[in-house]
């Protein structure tokens, strides 16, 4: 057969779907690999062909589109399962071709089982809500295209195992779940179950996402350097180890890059000749505020090193700050000569 542009196995699109639920999977060629869409390809006389490789098999085989009740079907560039079965798991390939052109890509599809509380190996999207911020919403994800707008589905929301009904501060509003005020207690997994009719059958779509309540932008401040500070002086003798921690608090800021760095005499440690090591540790609060500590270490400090300027710098989307460490050479204690004079007794 003629050469085909093979984009290989697109593991970036690890598609997971629940067992016994409808699934609609778009051919990734048009979304990520080709510069034209399905309609253009179709009108140019190109045909979209689907086939698959079962889990733990090497043999590519055609997809059976003649199953009872059209359980698997293709519509334009979408492969439909109504519904999925566990043994549908495998690598699926969509190939676009005519007599002179061919392009194909494979992607893994995993059919996942869930328990009665919606626990499963499914990778969950995370939605961040600002703490005590005002009304915020989450929306039942990935349900577009499953039913026409004329169909009115029923949507039930759950937190963990519990139906959201008479929950403090949480309002189920169809496809949306509105939080009047987000609190730490709202952290958890939220599931929407969308039920809709189709051709005399009832289908369910289950979508779970993780809500994480994070620091509010209303409370966000520029980085705060806790150490070094004016109260601590790093006093060392030559030959001793110099350890200076730079501890910085960063408010949570969505998509902010938090940075901490040291300069020695105005230069980055990499740009100077002294033997300096820097170790970083990061911790997070419950609302994802961040504390970064960078410890600057010079194993055997020299008197020259003790004269240098050591400055800790920090930057976030809220601003940039810097603080110099107070470093000085320990002055040796003076040696006093004690002379004891004897025999001053009274005569």
């Amino acid at each position: 057969s003629e050469r085909c542009d093979d984009w290989g196995l697109d593991t970036m699109r690890q598609i997971q779907v629940f067992e016994d639920e409808p699934a609609r999977i778009k051919c990734p060629l048009f979304e990520h690999f080709l510069k034209f869409n399905y309609s253009t390809a179709h009108s140019a006389g190109l045909t979209l062909i689907w086939y698959w490789t079962r889990q733990d098999r090497d043999l590519e085989e055609p997809i059976n589109f003649r199953l009872p009740e059209n359980r698997i079907s293709k519509e334009k560039d979408v492969l439909w399962f109504r519904p999925t079965l566990l043994n549908d798991t495998g690598n699926y390939t969509c190939m676009l071709r005519n007599t002179t052109y061919c392009s194909k890509v494979a992607f893994p599809l995993e059919v996942v089982q869930k328990d009665s509380c919606f626990n499963s190996p499914m990778k969950l999207p995370v939605h961040k809500l600002y703490i005590e911020y005002g009304i915020q919403r989450i929306t039942c994800p990935n349900v577009d295209g499953y039913f026409p707008s004329s169909v009115k589905p029923t949507i039930t929301w759950y937190m963990g195992c519990y139906k959201i009904q008479n929950f403090n501060n949480v309002i189920p509003e169809g496809m949306n779940l509105s939080f009047l005020i987000a609190l730490i207690s709202n952290n958890g997994n939220y599931t929407c179950v969308v039920t809709y009719p189709e051709n005399g059958r009832t289908f369910h779509l289950t979508r779970t996402l993780t809500v994480k309540v994070v620091g509010s932008p209303k409370n966000a401040v520029p980085p705060v350097i806790h150490s070094p500070n004016d109260h601590v002086v790093y006093e060392k003798e030559p030959g001793e180890e110099l350890l200076i921690p730079c501890t910085v608090y960063f408010s949570f800021l969505m998509d902010s890059r938090n940075e901490v760095w040291w300069t020695i005499d105005g230069k980055k440690p990499d740009d100077i000749t002294i033997d300096v090591t820097i170790n970083e540790s990061i911790s997070h609060s419950r609302t994802e505020d961040e504390t970064r500590t960078q410890i600057l270490s010079i194993k055997k400090v020299t008197s020259e090193d003790l004269k240098r300027s050591y400055v800790c710098h920090a930057r976030s989307a809220k601003g940039e700050v810097a603080k110099a460490a107070k470093v000085k050479q320990k002055v040796p204690a003076p040696r006093y000569t004690v002379e004891l004079a004897c025999g001053f007794g009274a005569t």
């Epitope: 005002g134 403090n168 309002i171 509105s178």
Partner: antibody, heavy 125, light 114 residues
């Protein structure tokens, strides 16, 4: 469990147009806190109920107001005193009404399960 | 803004009879609706919340149904003590330039017991 309303002073809530008044509502038998919202509703003589707004009784004290309020009324709360208050400013004759506070345990379902006895506010020159 | 329209008013029925009060929301409020009873000189009393959940201590003669934009309060086995005004209260959130919460009462329905 009850909500005891106060405010209106010696004149029993008689205010001149353009004047101000603070109405308060104290929880007894339960503590205001992160489980509750305090909401305010008014009722003009012979008319229906009209929602004014709600304040979250927890630490942040977030407030939501009816659109018609437009900054004239302000909700506040004091967790230590277990009290919610409604400050009424720039009063007009149209604000003459019985003002009720109510506890909303869910906020999401308007389960206003406990009400104050009401304070009559009369705006007249 | 959310508008709640209540019908009919007034409504009358004999003791032992059934009364149905309707409430229509101007937009989909799902099940986020409560019903209140108010007698003259008294504050309102919660009957039903979440469209159909009976509040604590409320007799089972009162029932609520509906979702979306159409809601109904039904009082069966009407008693003379049920003579009062009844109000629906709808809730919805609005996400926009100013995220806000709407609580809107219906105009009220007077129930007369003959």
């Amino acid at each position: 469990q009850q909500l005891e309303q106060s405010g209106g002073g010696a004149e029993g809530g008689l205010v001149k147009p353009g004047g101000s008044l603070e109405l308060c509502c104290k929880a007894s038998g339960f503590s205001l806190g992160s489980s509750y919202w305090i909401c305010w509703v008014r009722q003009a003589p012979g008319k229906g109920l009209e929602w004014i707004g709600c304040i979250y009784a927890g630490s942040s004290g977030i407030t939501y107001y009816a659109s018609w309020v437009s900054g004239r009324f302000t909700l506040s709360r004091d967790i230590d005193q277990s009290t919610g208050c409604l400050q009424l400013n720039s009063l007009t004759a149209a604000d003459t009404a019985m003002y009720y506070c109510a506890r909303d345990i869910y906020a999401s379902t308007s389960g206003y399960d406990l009400w104050g006895q009401g304070t009559l506010v009369t705006v007249s020159s | 803004a959310l508008v709640m329209t209540q019908t009919p008013s007034p409504v009358s029925a004999a003791v032992g009879g059934t009364v149905t009060i309707n409430c229509q929301a101007s937009e989909d409020i799902y099940s986020n609706l409560a019903w209140f009873q108010q007698k003259p000189g008294q504050p309102p009393k919660l009957l039903i919340y979440q469209a159909s959940t009976l509040a604590s201590g409320v007799p089972s003669r009162f029932s609520g149904s509906g979702s979306g934009t159409e809601f109904t309060l039904t009082i069966s086995g009407l008693q003379s003590d049920d003579a009062a005004a009844y109000y629906c209260l709808g809730v919805c959130t609005y996400i926009g330039a100013d995220n806000t919460l709407y609580n809107t009462f219906g105009g009220g329905t007077e129930v007369v017991v003959k």
